[in-house]
Structure formats: C-alpha cells, structure tokens
C-alpha cells in the first residue's frame, strides 16, 4: 500500500477520505486505527456503526469521527480540533470477522496555524527534510508519500 499524506492546520478540522470498492467490501464494517511504531500493531481509534446498514451515521470517539458511504464506496474520517499529537501514521480498515483489510495507509501531518504566533517548535512534520514542492498546502490536502520519506519520526 502506498501512503497518502493528509495535511491539516492545528486547531482546525482535518477530513481524511478512503475510497474503496463498494461491492468487494459489501456488508463489512470499517475502522480507523493508529499505527504504533513502524512494525507495531494498529490501535483502533473508532469504527463504524455496529449495524452495517447504519454505517452512514457519524460515530465519534473523542475528537475523531467516522462515517461510511457504503453505496459510493468512501470512508470519511474527521479529526476535529487537530493537535500536534495527532500527527502520525494511520490506516483505514475493512473488517471481516477478526480480520482487517487495509483500505488506505494515511500519514497525518499537522501544520502550524499561521495566525497562531506561539512557539511552533512542538509541531512535528514527518520527513520535514524532504521536498514539499509538490504539495500545495491547504486545509485537508492529501498526496502520496514520496519515496524515501519517513512515515515515523526519528527516534532519539
């Protein structure tokens, strides 16, 4: 799976979309999980409604919401009031039994609020040494991760 980068501004909402084949994943609930380390498990953040026919209902866990257009084949995750600690690698998953298929790997980047003049030193930008010339930065922009970019922050 390629990794898609979604950039959002601190304090604002970020919307992540994960397209999928609606027929292939028919009847399957979906989930949004956070990757714990490069080879670690993916920790469930929020999942769609227990009843697949109600997957379009928005479900919240804290500041994260999920909703699924099961006919159109688009899973949408909203991260409200985006914070620096929200940055990292996530997955959109399709659930079947105890198994989970990865629909999309997502790298969330948190950009400093240009109107916030506080110290932005605690904001982490994955692969910030890499070129971002191809990314037009705006609210909820996404792009594929460039080859060589590091999806996890370097460990000190």
């Amino acid at each position: 799976h390629n990794t898609t980068v979604f950039q959002g501004v601190a304090g604002q909402s970020l919307q992540v979309s994960c397209p999928y084949d609606s027929m292939k994943h028919w009847g399957r609930r979906k989930a949004w999980c956070r990757q714990l380390g490069e080879k670690g498990p993916c920790q469930r953040v929020v999942s769609t409604h227990n009843l697949w026919l109600l997957s379009f209902l928005r479900r919240w866990n804290g500041s994260t919401a999920i909703t699924d257009d099961t006919l159109g084949g688009t899973l949408t995750i909203t991260l409200r009031n985006l914070q620096p600690h929200d940055a990292g690698l996530y997955q959109c998953q399709s659930l079947h039994g105890s198994e989970a298929d990865t629909l999309r790997k997502v790298l969330v980047e948190v950009l400093a609020d240009p109107l916030d003049h506080r110290d932005a030193g605690d904001l982490w930008f994955p692969g910030e040494s890499e070129s971002f010339e191809d990314a037009h930065v705006e609210h909820s922009i996404s792009r594929s991760l460039l080859e060589g970019e590091i999806p996890f922050p370097p460990t000190s």
Partner: antibody, heavy 126, light 106 residues
Framework: EVQLVESGGGLVQPGRSLRLSCTAS????????MSWFRQAPGKGLEWVGF??????????EYTASVKGRFTISRDGSKSIAYLQMNSLKTEDTAVYYC?????????????????WGQGTMVTVSS | DIQMTQSPSSLSASVGDRVTITCQAS??????LNWYQQKPGKAPKLLIY???NLETGVPSRFSGSGSGTDFTFTISSLQPEDIATYYC????????FGGGTKVEIK
C-alpha cells in the same frame, strides 16, 4: 393510505417454524428499510431485525438472540416483507410488528420507524 | 451494549399538567434517540426522531430535547388522549428501547 398489515401468527410448538408476512401498501416498498419488532406480553419493545431497501440489496441485520434462527426477506413485486422463524422457543412468544424506517433520501434513512402494522400474536407453547 | 434507563416507570398527572419523562443512556449516543407512544392493544407511534424533531402530524404539545447521555420528553399540557406508554429508542449502538413510562390521568 400508507399501511402495513401483518399475518401468519398463531400457536406453535417449541422447535417448530412459522413465517410471518407484512404486506405494504400506499408507498414505494422497494425504497424503504423494513424492520421487525416484538413485544412479549406485558413487556417492552424489542428490535428483531431489519432488511435494507433495494439500493442496499436487501441486506439484513438481526438482534443477537435471533441470529441464525430468524431470517428476514422481501418480495418487491408483492410489496411483502417476511419473517421466517425457525427453532422457536417459548421466550419468542410475543406480538410481532413490522415497521418502516423513516427515509431522508435514496441513500439515507434513519432508524426512526414511522409506519407500523397492527401486530400479529405468536405463541410458542407445547 | 448500551442500556437505556427510562424514568419514571409510571406517573399520574392531571389534564393540563406538564409531564416530563427522562431517558438516560449508559454512554454517549449523540442525538441518536427517538420517542414513541403506545396505547393499550395498539402499535407504537413515532412522535420524536433524532432527539428533538417532531414527526409530521404529531401535536406540538409533544417535544424532545437532549444529547449525549441525557434526554427529555415533554408533554406541555397533558390531554386525556395522551394516556399511553412512552418509549425512548436509541440507535447509536444497535436498536434498543427504554423500559417505558406509563402515563395515567389523576
């Protein structure tokens, strides 16, 4: 007039089967999610399961206590929803209602049930 | 699973009284809650959907409010025809009903 009429209830022995019907009229049946509920004598309401509209390929969902025993189906040409009940238990004794899910658009509905049938009594006893 | 605790289980009020029924969810259910009226020997009737929306054709004396875990159903001026049992129903987790509140006239 929008209407739902249930039929097929009666007295049945434990372990046997029964099929209930819910005949719809006055609305475009295929466009709506249809649900079954039950109410044991002197008790509250319990959701049994529902079946999606034609857009959702008549996908079904059930409450845990009936999963594997009850099957909901629909016949769009006759505007009928069915509840096939197998391996009946005495605790399945109840008035069974069918109901229509409230519709917002072709894709979206809400599990607020805005039209109900009059109910049909199912008694499971030896 | 979510538990819906409805209170009181029964109440007696006079015609014209303001009647309030509460429904408490065991966890946050947003506004995913409906209210129904059921008269003896009859099918339930939808009154309020999505916590606060009045169903078409339902008298305006009925209203609903709340979000999260605490919800309220109100009859602003009780009428003789309001004698019934009222149920809340959540749909955040599955489809679960409260235990019901039987409303009688004093």
């Amino acid at each position: 007039e929008v209407q739902l009429v249930e039929s097929g209830g009666g007295l049945v022995q434990p372990g046997r089967s029964l099929r209930l019907s819910c005949t719809a009229s006055g609305f475009t049946f295929d466009d709506y999610t249809m649900s079954w509920f039950r109410q044991a004598p002197g008790k509250g309401l319990e959701w049994v399961g529902f079946i999606g509209s034609k857009a959702y390929s008549a996908t079904t969902e059930y409450t845990a206590s009936v999963k594997g025993r009850f099957t909901i189906s629909r016949d769009g040409s006759k505007s009928i929803a069915y509840l096939q009940m197998n391996s009946l238990k005495t605790e399945d004794t109840a008035v069974y209602y069918c109901a229509r899910g409230k519709r917002y658009s072709y894709t979206y509905w809400t599990p607020a049930f805005d039209v109900w049938g009059q109910g049909t009594m199912v008694t499971v006893s030896s | 699973d979510i538990q819906m605790t409805q209170s009181p289980s029964s109440l007696s009020a006079s015609v014209g009284d303001r009647v309030t029924i509460t429904c408490q969810a065991s966890q946050d259910i947003t506004n995913y809650l409906n209210w129904y009226q059921q008269k003896p020997g009859k099918a339930p009737k939808l009154l309020i959907y999505d916590a606060s929306n009045l169903e078409t054709g339902v008298p305006s004396r009925f209203s609903g409010s709340g979000s999260g875990t605490d919800f309220t159903f109100t009859i602003s001026s009780l009428q003789p025809e309001d004698i019934a049992t009222y149920y809340c129903q959540e749909y955040d987790s599955y489809i679960t009903f409260g235990g019901g509140t039987k409303v009688e006239i004093k």
